[in-house]
């Protein structure tokens, strides 16, 4: 048997082209110079290499760059990116948004893989913060990206970046995440007029405190029930019946359908039944007339 480690005569690759698809795997390994491959990475995606052949090419790059690929190679990886492990990606230093976009494009339409998550993590850490352009890019590819971050990570999002956030980007955020994002959104949109402000701030309201909800109730915003149901329970409880009525406007009728669910259920328990009756919705469960309500939390604060 011929020892299959040396490149056969006349098979040395002069450039990365279509002729290589009929090279055996061992011939690719023996006949394609890794440095040539690195400089012509952009050509690889145009050539229908098999899955196995791509593994050979990756192996060649790994041997050439044991400490991690340079960005000039990373930017042109294309489908070869799908072969990278999180361990490979942790060795990279990706600073260009164009590189990030190029690699996210390869994974487009698929869920965020461990590779993509690692890539984004490396990129954001390298930049020091989630700037607007980065957030724009990430949420365009992965609408749920923002809600995958911890509250600590979200704290590095500058208020200016909030302009890139769309309502659907916040669909899977939990209250802890909205607690961090809401003050940033409030700051970002502070110069907008009433109705425009409400449109922008609406999806962040799951992080709003009571005083902000009270202020909104004075602005005829007509909050829909879906938004109301996502509000923090502790922020809703202190609202009076009149304030909730003003906050919801014509949508107040929807309270009846939600009376068994939080935060409506808990809010009802805190209201005087007399006050609830003024809504004419048949809401039951309020404090019976003649009962005295002691706010023990206020008493504790005073003592």
């Amino acid at each position: 048997e011929v020892e299959k480690t040396a490149c056969p005569s006349g098979k040395k690759a002069r450039e990365i082209d279509e002729s290589l698809i009929f090279y055996k795997k061992w011939e690719l390994e023996a006949c394609v110079d890794a440095a040539l491959l690195a400089t012509q990475m952009d050509r690889v995606n145009a050539i229908p290499f098999t899955y196995e052949q791509l593994d050979v090419l990756k192996h060649k790059l790994d041997e050439l760059y044991p400490q991690g690929y340079p960005e000039s190679v990373i930017q042109h990886l294309g489908y070869l990116f799908l072969k990278m492990s999180p361990e490979d990606i942790r060795k990279w230093n990706v600073t260009s948004l164009e590189t990030l976009k190029a690699l996210l494009e390869v994974n487009k339409g698929h869920e965020m893989s461990p590779q993509v998550a690692t890539l984004i993590d490396r990129f954001v850490k390298g930049r020091g913060q989630l700037d607007k352009d980065t957030l724009d890019t990430l949420t365009a590819f992965y609408p749920g990206y923002l809600c995958s971050l911890s509250p600590e990570e979200l704290s590095s999002v500058p208020p200016s970046s909030i302009w890139a956030v769309r309502p659907q980007d916040l669909d899977t955020c939990d209250p802890r995440q909205l607690d961090v994002l809401y003050p940033k959104a409030r700051l970002a949109f502070q110069n907008m007029n009433g109705s425009e402000y409400f449109v922008k701030i609406q999806s962040f309201l799951g992080g709003a405190p009571t005083e902000d909800l009270k202020a909104l109730s004075q602005q005829n915003v007509s909050m829909d029930l879906a938004t109301f149901m996502k509000l923090r329970t502790d922020a809703v409880l202190p609202l009076t019946v009149a304030e909730v009525q003003k906050l919801l406007g014509p949508h107040v009728e929807g309270l009846k359908a939600e009376e068994r669910h939080r935060p409506v259920r808990d809010w009802i328990l805190r209201q005087r039944q007399d006050d609830l009756d003024t809504l004419g919705l048949g809401l039951q469960g309020g404090i019976p007339n003649g009962y005295l309500v002691l706010d023990l939390s206020m008493q504790e604060a005073l003592s």
């Epitope: 048997e1 299959k4 480690t5 055996k24 795997k25 061992w26 098999t50 899955y51």
Partner: antibody
Framework: QSQLVESGGGRVQPGGSLRLSCAVS????????MGWVRQAPGKCLEYIGY???????YYASWAKGRFTISKDNSKNTVYLQMNSLRAEDTATYFC????????????????WGQGTQVTVSS | ALQMTQSPSSLSARVGDRVTIKCQAS??????LAWYQQKPGKPPKFLIY???DLASGVPSRFSGSGSGRDFTLTISSLQPEDFATYYC????????????FGCGTKVTVL
């Protein structure tokens, strides 16, 4: 003289797992690809998958997820982990070496082990 | 997905006959084809690689030809020890395929 000896076969209940081993001698696993092929009684040869010299693995579409090939170069052994076994997995399981010293499956399989019988039934 | 089709599935012949077995790939595989011989209760034996190159120790009465999609294994003068099942195998792409082997051609005594 290259030799391959399979072991680990036997009877297993549906839904069970089994790990087959293929002990090799006469060559190094760091230079050759190693594959697994099975054959049900009276049926065709059925490719399961292979592992290259650098450890990358490739599988038949039907084997992905249930079957896993691995190797330990220092022990000169290749493994086939089989999970969620079904009656239709009953067969003789062969391990085979890639014939080419290039380390990938480029030319075919040669030599082959004698095979180990796996029976899946309750 | 890449598939291999062998024909005929069985054939009967006499000692001394010239026997031809065909194998077709569903897409071009260049010359990345191997042939095997298998006898009952034994593992397959490697006969031919690269569609036409004889493996070590294989008698010269065996020959292979073809490229692209269509391939042929020929036994020029059938010997008693050649009665067996013959399989082709594509080695162009071994990932995520249903099977790399054809389903065999059984050669029996007429």
């Amino acid at each position: 003289q290259s030799q391959l000896v399979e072991s680990g076969g036997g009877r297993v209940q549906p839904g069970g797992s089994l790990r087959l081993s293929c002990a090799v001698s006469g060559f190094s696993l760091s230079s050759y690809a190693m594959g697994w092929v099975r054959q049900a009684p009276g049926k065709c040869l059925e490719y399961i998958g292979y592992i290259s010299k650098i450890g990358t693995t490739y599988y038949a579409s039907w084997a992905k997820g249930r079957f896993t090939i691995s190797k330990d170069n220092s022990k000169n052994t290749v493994y086939l982990q089989m999970n969620s076994l079904r009656a239709e997995d009953t067969a003789t399981y062969f391990c085979a070496r890639g014939s080419s010293s290039g380390g990938y499956l480029d030319d075919g399989f040669d030599p082959w082990g004698q095979g180990t019988q796996v029976t899946v039934s309750s | 997905a890449l598939q291999m089709t062998q024909s005929p599935s069985s054939l009967s012949a006499r000692v001394g006959d010239r026997v031809t077995i065909k194998c077709q790939a569903s897409q071009s595989i260049s010359n990345y084809l191997a042939w095997y011989q298998q006898k009952p209760g034994k593992p397959p034996k490697f006969l031919i690689y690269d569609a036409s190159d004889l493996a070590s120790g294989v008698p010269s009465r065996f020959s292979g030809s073809g490229s692209g999609r269509d391939f042929t294994l020929t036994i020029s003068s059938l010997q008693p020890e050649d009665f067996a099942t013959y399989y082709c195998q594509q080695v162009y792409d071994s990932n995520n395929v249903e099977n790399v082997f054809g389903c065999g051609t059984k050669v029996t005594v007429l």
